[in-house]
């Protein structure tokens, strides 16, 4: 019964970019300006997203797809579909409630977003520090001593087998 009704429903013939207009005997009417329908059989069109203020338009709204926003220079997207814009900081800084603050000693941030992370402790892996860390860059750990001894093989060991669906690092 449900299937029969859907086949007889004139609204199911309305393509994306239109809506089924109840006020006009269920005729398929084009979406009004600044609205869209991304699927067929819609009884209303959705209002287009407007990229205002710190948001800027990455993709214009069309009758079949919503507008897409990104952030103005000096800001970066957060959240699904760029639902928020967050202020950029410089490398070597992190964003706090009081604004951008330099990374504390022993931490770094090599991006304009995100938080300061601790320098790698090379000795935990039996390695030594080749280059000291900075606010903008992690330390560089050298190879393990075994890799440096006479007769150490230059051949890179094969990567361990990975389960299907796992991407390499």
């Amino acid at each position: 019964f449900e299937r029969t009704r859907s086949l007889q429903d004139p609204c199911s013939n309305c393509p994306a970019g239109t809506f089924c207009d109840n006020n006009r005997n269920q005729i398929c009417s084009p979406c009004p300006p600044n609205s869209f329908s991304s699927a067929g059989g819609q009884r209303t069109c959705d209002i287009c997203r407007q990229c205002k203020g710190v948001f800027r338009t990455r993709k214009e709204c069309s009758s079949t797809s919503n507008a897409e926003c990104d952030c103005t220079p000096g800001f970066h997207c957060l959240g699904a579909g760029c639902s928020m814009c967050e202020q950029d900081c410089k490398q070597g800084q992190e964003l706090t409630k009081k604004g951008c603050k330099d990374c504390c000693f022993g931490t770094f941030n090599d991006q304009k977003r995100g938080i300061c992370r601790p320098w790698t402790n090379c000795s935990l892996d039996g390695k030594s520090v080749l280059v000291n860390g900075t606010k903008e860059r992690d330390v560089v750990c050298g190879p393990s001593p075994a890799d440096l001894s006479p007769g150490a093989s230059s051949v890179t060991p094969p990567a361990p087998a990975r389960e299907p669906g796992h991407s390499p690092q």
């Epitope: 090379c122 080749l130 280059v131 860059r137 560089v140 050298g142 190879p143 690092q169």
Partner: nanobody, 116 residues
């Protein structure tokens, strides 16, 4: 892990020059540093030069002012320009990709021989 292939080694007279090149099979940008090491027969492998992702460089004292390391992240290559070569520079030169969180990736090495 990337695969690394070196080229440019060979026999050269003292005072001459060579340019070694290291080609990586994948992106080198995410590595903490790219480096050249060398190993003479019976000796420990030693760091010659390294370059970090932000292009900070470090050189062994014995090669400062003579060797220059550079990288091209678009081509995934690391070069070592070697000038004023000395007999004591004779060794197998190996490219390395240094990643703090994993084992070092090594190339197979290329022989450099400096005759007097």
């Amino acid at each position: 892990q990337v695969q690394l292939v070196e080229s440019g080694g060979g026999l050269v007279q003292a005072g001459g020059s060579l340019r070694l090149s290291c080609a990586a099979s994948g992106s080198i940008f995410s590595y903490n540093a790219m480096a050249w090491y060398r190993q003479a027969p019976g000796k420990q492998r030693e760091l010659v030069a390294l370059i970090t992702s932000d292009r900070t460089t470090k050189y062994a004292d014995s090669v400062k002012g003579r060797f220059t390391i550079s990288r091209d992240d678009t081509k995934n290559t690391v070069d070592l320009e070697m000038n004023s070569l000395k007999p004591e520079d004779t060794a197998v030169y190996t490219c390395a990709a240094l990643l703090n969180s994993a084992r070092t990736s090594w190339g197979q090495g290329t022989q450099v021989t400096v005759s007097s």
